[in-house]
């Protein structure tokens, strides 16, 4: 904490410039007014001040503002935004999407904070839902901000934005992420052609029940190997040899060296050997030619 | 994380000259350049003169004229020329210099003594 001491004659700031950065700790504190500072907060960070010099600043704004800054003060912290706690950013309002972007700039590059964590919480909440506009820009900033959300907080993107989601954007997701985006995906490409729709849907299938499977079996849309093992493996499981052998279509040569692996692994398990045999490649460890396969999933559901 | 050392300080008679260098250990990725502060006992650090990203220079008003920021970025090194040399510039010189993730990195100082 700065002590309170006078303004030394001569001293007083009569705007933001960068004769500040000479003043010590104490004289900031003395010498430069806070509304004045709220007022010219866009000039702050052309000046190159040291963090330390950055927390008297913080410290003026907190006394100014005690129940949180106004929008007018956040856009323009710029580097000032690394002093915030997240208690500090709790207090806002932000709904301007240019504030959010002046933000996430300082950030840039590197992971997320807790501050830019709780900052995009605070706007999203304030919007009510995750937009295409608001979801654009946090996915350019962190790719990876869709799969950090839960499913809960996923149910709250509306289809029209799933149009924002680039294919690395989902690379961390889980299961329960993806069946919950992928319902979204499939009502937003709707009404896209069938090369095109597979296309744009492609990075979402790892939420894909087994009928749709089926049908872009029959859409000789060549699914890559890549895309197939990320397929739930309950969705895989109940897919005929034939129908795998459509949806890869060139690609399925690549099932022999996935047959460790699942889901390929335990659809192997589940086919028979004689249908397997069909497609060339050696799979081995499907079901012996004679025997009988209960489904006891179907015997549980009737009993 | 980038190491900052300091020196040529020592003890000079007034209207005498000292150079003081900072070597960093590698390349710094400072917001702000690098600066050269000091402190005296009981007082609060202040900045002397700072030598920005592009090369522009800023010098507190006490010591216009006299002292000069440089840097030789083939050696990773600021100096501050310090000329005509006064008690009150008598203190621990520091370098230091800003990130781009909220902290402040000094050097650990050298002393300059400015006494007849």
């Known amino acids: 904490e700065v002590e309170k001491t006078a303004c030394p004659s001569g001293k007083k700031a009569r705007e933001i410039d960068e004769s500040l950065i000479f003043y010590k700790k104490w004289e900031l504190e003395a010498c430069v007014d806070a509304a004045l500072l709220a007022t010219q907060m866009d000039r702050v960070n052309a000046i190159p001040f040291t963090y330390e010099q950055l927390d008297v600043l913080k410290h003026k704004l907190d006394e100014l503002y005690p129940q949180g800054y106004p929008e007018s003060v956040i856009q323009h912290l710029g580097y000032l935004f690394l002093k915030m706690s997240p208690e500090d950013i709790r207090k806002w309002n932000v709904t301007s999407l240019e504030t959010l972007k002046a933000l996430l700039e300082v950030n840039k590059g590197h992971e997320m904070s807790p501050q830019v964590a709780t900052l995009i919480d605070r706007f999203v909440k304030g919007r009510g839902q995750l937009d295409k506009d608001t979801l654009d820009t946090l996915t350019a900033f962190y790719p990876g901000y869709l799969c950090s959300l839960s499913p809960e907080e996923l149910s709250s993107v509306p289809p029209s934005s799933i149009w924002a989601v680039r294919p690395q954007d989902l690379d961390t997701c889980d299961p329960r992420q993806l069946d919950v985006l992928y319902p979204k995906a499939r009502l937003a490409f709707q009404n896209m052609n069938g090369s095109e729709y597979f296309v744009k849907i492609q990075s979402f299938l790892g939420g894909a029940p087994t009928e749709d499977l089926k049908a872009l079996s029959q859409q000789n849309v060549s699914m890559d190997l890549a895309t197939f093992m990320k397929l739930r493996t309950d969705a895989v499981l109940p897919l005929t040899v034939a129908e795998v052998q459509k949806l890869l279509g060139p690609h399925v040569e690549g099932l022999k060296a996935e047959e460790r692996h699942r889901p390929v692994r335990d659809w192997i398990l589940r086919q028979r050997q004689d249908d397997l045999d069909t497609l060339g490649l050696g799979l081995q460890g499907g079901i012996p030619n004679g025997y009988l396969v209960l489904d006891l999933s179907m015997q549980e559901a009737l009993s | 994380q980038v190491q900052l050392v300091e020196s040529g300080g020592g003890v000079v008679q007034p209207g005498g000259s000292l150079r003081l260098s900072c070597a960093t250990s590698?390349?710094?990725?400072?917001?702000?350049?690098m600066g050269w502060f000091r402190q005296a006992p009981g007082k609060q650090r202040e900045l002397v003169a700072r030598?920005?990203?592009?090369?522009?220079?800023m010098y507190a008003d006490s010591v216009k004229g006299r002292f000069t920021i440089s840097r030789d970025n083939s050696k990773n090194t600021v100096y501050l020329q310090m000329n005509s040399l006064k008690p009150e510039d008598t203190a621990v010189y520091y370098c230091?210099?800003?990130?781009?993730?909220?902290?402040?990195?000094w050097g650990q100082g050298t002393q300059v003594t400015v006494s007849s």
């Open positions: 590698g390349t710094i990725f400072s917001r702000n350049g």
């Open positions: 230091g210099y800003s990130d781009y993730r909220g902290t402040d990195y």
């Open positions: 030598i920005l990203n592009d090369g522009t220079t």
